[in-house]
């Protein structure tokens, strides 16, 4: 899959899980760098991926809510990310400065199911996103005007 950032260092990847969706995220940020990421698969937190340290932000997805697009910002290391969801919310981690790229699936209806990349002592050197169809597809019209986000204004 496509990787964003200059690369280098040790590889990391979330656990491949065919039975659970991503239901939450923890992102640790310190010294203007994204240090690590951790996904919640169903009810359980997967292993923390990346470097040590930083302050951790945690977000919880609502039932039936998925991450559908990600912006990433690099300056030698991953500086920030914005994750957009299927319920018109977004979550902001770190700072969106430097080289900004957007990541989204090639197939309509696919959602984020995994994260992979490379890290060094100071932080994440590259990151990639695995997209796939959700286990249970939504069967109703899209939601209208959901108005709150955990830590930022609504938008997509």
């Amino acid at each position: 899959g496509k990787m964003y950032g200059p690369g280098g260092g040790k590889y990391f990847s979330t656990t491949e899980d065919y039975d659970h969706e991503i239901t939450g995220l923890r992102v640790s940020v310190g010294l203007l760098l994204v240090k690590s990421v951790q996904v919640k698969l169903g009810d359980s937190w997967d292993v923390k991926l990346g470097a040590l340290g930083g302050n951790t932000q945690e977000v919880t997805l609502q039932p039936g809510e998925y991450i559908t697009k990600v912006f990433v910002a690099f300056q030698a290391f991953l500086r920030g990310m914005v994750m957009y969801t299927s319920k018109d919310r977004y979550f902001y981690f770190g700072k969106l400065d430097g080289q900004i790229s957007s990541a989204y699936p090639s197939q309509e209806g696919q959602v984020l199911v995994g994260i992979y990349g490379q890290y060094q002592l100071l932080g994440i050197k590259s990151i990639g996103f695995e997209w796939n169809y959700p286990l249970e597809e939504p069967t109703t019209e899209p939601p209208v005007n959901l108005t709150y986000s955990a830590n930022s204004p609504v938008g997509r």
Epitope: Y104, Q107, P138, R156
Partner: antibody, heavy 121, light 112 residues
């Protein structure tokens, strides 16, 4: 009810460009990707690409990369497909299509009426 | 790219008889995560846009008569019209939504 209404037939010369429009009604255009599919006379269906009208993200079939541009104007609920450097084998009916509401996968349940583009010198 | 190959190219069937169309993909359309086959069937009549009949290989779209059924998994799929009616004369296409979107070349169904 859901409707996709396309612009009228076009006749173009080789090397020219054509821009086909698809006006959506009965739903919010921002909630669904718009796909474009073409069909040469007496031939099969060929997927060209999609645009997400919410943010303008696009994904084009490899065959059309560099020649096709998909855009949208959400204020008038309209998607556009522009094909440049036209050749005679681009003569086809061009359709816009939208998925069903029953699943998020791109099963094309709603189609425009088609726009015939004829490329001839 | 995934290549979709239909057989036969054309088919003549008597009214009330069974019509069977095959579709083969160059790679499996079974998604190991969702355990679904990302294959659809469309019907196209002359001068009209295609109409969605079946998706996920076997799920009938709302309003589609139950004489239409889909089966198969992985790389081999079948559309069956159990009792051909005059209004079923059309070209039928399979389409994969596993990796981007590709249609088969079409199968023309006529009355014998």
């Amino acid at each position: 009810q859901v409707q996709l209404v396309q612009s009228g037939a076009e006749v173009k010369k080789p090397g020219a460009s054509v821009k086909v429009s698809c006006k959506a009604s009965g739903f919010n255009i921002k909630d669904y990707y718009m796909h474009w599919v073409r069909q040469a006379p007496g031939q099969g269906l060929e997927w060209m690409g999609w645009i997400d009208p919410e943010n303008g993200n696009t994904n084009y079939a490899q065959k059309f990369q560099g020649r096709v541009t998909m855009t949208r104007d959400t204020s008038i609920s309209t998607a556009y497909m522009e094909l440049s450097r036209l050749r005679s084998d681009d003569t086809a009916v061009y359709y816009c299509a939208r998925r069903a509401i029953t699943t998020a996968t791109a099963w094309f349940a709603y189609w425009g009426q088609g726009t015939l583009v004829t490329v001839s010198s | 790219d995934i290549v979709m190959t239909q057989s036969p190219d054309s088919l003549a069937v008597s009214l009330g008889e069974r019509a069977t169309i095959n579709c083969k993909s160059s790679q499996s359309l079974l998604n190991s995560r969702t355990r679904k086959n990302y294959l659809a069937w469309y019907q196209q009549k002359p001068g009209q846009p295609p109409k969605l009949l079946i998706y996920w290989a076997s799920t009938r779209e709302s309003g589609v008569p139950d004489r239409f059924s889909g089966s198969g998994s992985g790389t081999d799929f079948t559309l069956t019209i159990s009792s051909l009616q005059a209004e079923d004369v059309a070209v039928y296409y399979c389409k994969q939504s596993y990796n981007l979107y590709t249609f088969g070349q079409g199968t023309k169904v006529e009355i014998k």
